[in-house]
C-alpha cells in the first residue's frame, strides 16, 4: 500500500546519511550537478540536477526516493526555477546540502 | 522493444524463472520493471532492479518470494519467482523507461509511465 509521506521522508534521509557515511572514493566521480533553491518544489527540482549524472550507481536508490515526491516525470537536461543555473556542486556536497535540509523539515513535521 | 519468456504452467508452491531481453538496445544501461495483468484487473507493479543492480523493490504482494536480478553482460534480467500461488496467475510484462533507476512505486508519481514494454508472457498457477 501507500508509504506514509513521513516513512517516505525518513527513509529518504537514511538514505543520504548512508551515502555521505559510505562515501570511499569521490561520490559519482566528482560530478558536478546544478545547484538548487531549497524550497517548495525542492524533490523535483534535486531530481532534475541529479538525473544529469551517468552511470553513479551510488545514487540510483536517492533518485528513486526522490521519484516519489515528484509528481511529473523528470527527463534529463530539463530545469525548473529552482535551479540555481550559475552555481554548480559537487554531487557529494549536494547531497550533504539535501540531507541538512531534509533533517530540518523532518524536524519541523514538514513530510510532502 | 523487450521480449519476455519464461512463463508457463505451474502447481501452487511451484517456481518459475521469468527472462526479459531487449534484442534493439543495451537492457545494461536502464532499470527494468516487472508488471502483470489477470483478467479483468489493471495492470499491477511487481518489481524493479535498477541499473547497476544495487537498489531492488518488491510489491508487498511478492516481497520474499520473488527475486528480481540482472546480467549486464548477456542483455537479460530476471524474476524468479518462488511459492507461487493462483493469485499470482496473470501475464507478466517488463518495462523500461531508459533511465537507470527504478521509480517510486507509491509515491506521488503517478506521472512516471514507462515507454517501452515487452508483449508479455502467461503464467498460471493451478492444480
Known amino acids: 500500500g501507500p508509504v506514509p509521506p513521513s516513512t517516505a521522508l525518513r527513509e529518504l534521509i537514511e538514505e543520504l546519511v548512508n551515502i555521505t557515511q559510505n562515501q570511499k572514493a569521490p561520490l559519482c566521480n566528482g560530478s558536478m550537478v546544478w545547484s538548487i533553491n531549497l524550497t517548495a518544489g525542492m524533490y523535483c527540482a534535486a531530481l532534475e540536477s541529479l538525473i544529469n549524472v551517468s552511470g553513479c550507481s551510488a545514487i540510483e536508490k536517492t533518485q528513486r526516493m526522490l521519484s516519489g515526491f515528484c509528481p511529473h516525470k523528470v527527463s534529463a537536461g530539463q530545469f525548473s526555477s529552482l535551479h540555481v543555473r550559475d552555481t554548480k556542486i559537487e554531487v557529494a556536497q549536494f547531497v550533504k546540502d539535501l540531507l541538512l535540509h531534509l533533517k530540518k523539515l523532518f524536524r519541523e513535521g514538514q513530510f510532502n | 522493444q523487450l521480449v519476455e519468456s519464461g512463463g508457463g504452467s505451474v502447481q501452487p508452491g511451484g517456481s518459475l524463472r521469468l527472462s526479459c531481453a531487449a534484442p534493439?538496445?543495451?537492457?545494461?544501461?536502464?532499470?527494468i520493471a516487472w508488471f502483470r495483468q489477470s483478467p479483468g484487473k489493471e495492470r499491477e507493479w511487481v518489481s524493479c532492479?535498477?541499473?547497476?543492480?544495487?537498489?531492488?523493490i518488491y510489491s508487498d504482494s511478492v516481497k520474499g518470494r520473488f527475486t528480481i536480478s540482472r546480467d549486464n553482460t548477456k542483455n537479460m534480467v530476471y524474476l524468479q519467482m518462488n511459492s507461487l500461488n493462483p493469485e499470482d496467475t496473470a501475464v507478466y510484462y517488463c518495462?523500461?523507461?531508459?533511465?537507470?533507476?527504478?521509480?517510486?512505486?507509491?509515491?506521488?508519481?503517478?506521472?512516471?509511465?514507462?515507454?517501452?514494454w515487452g508483449q508479455g508472457t502467461q503464467v498460471t498457477v493451478s492444480s
Open positions: 518495462a523500461t523507461d531508459k533511465r537507470s533507476f527504478c521509480y517510486a512505486p507509491n509515491g506521488l508519481g503517478k506521472g512516471w509511465t514507462y515507454d517501452y
Open positions: 534493439r538496445f543495451t537492457l545494461g544501461s536502464y532499470a
Open positions: 532492479i535498477s541499473r547497476s543492480g544495487g537498489d531492488t
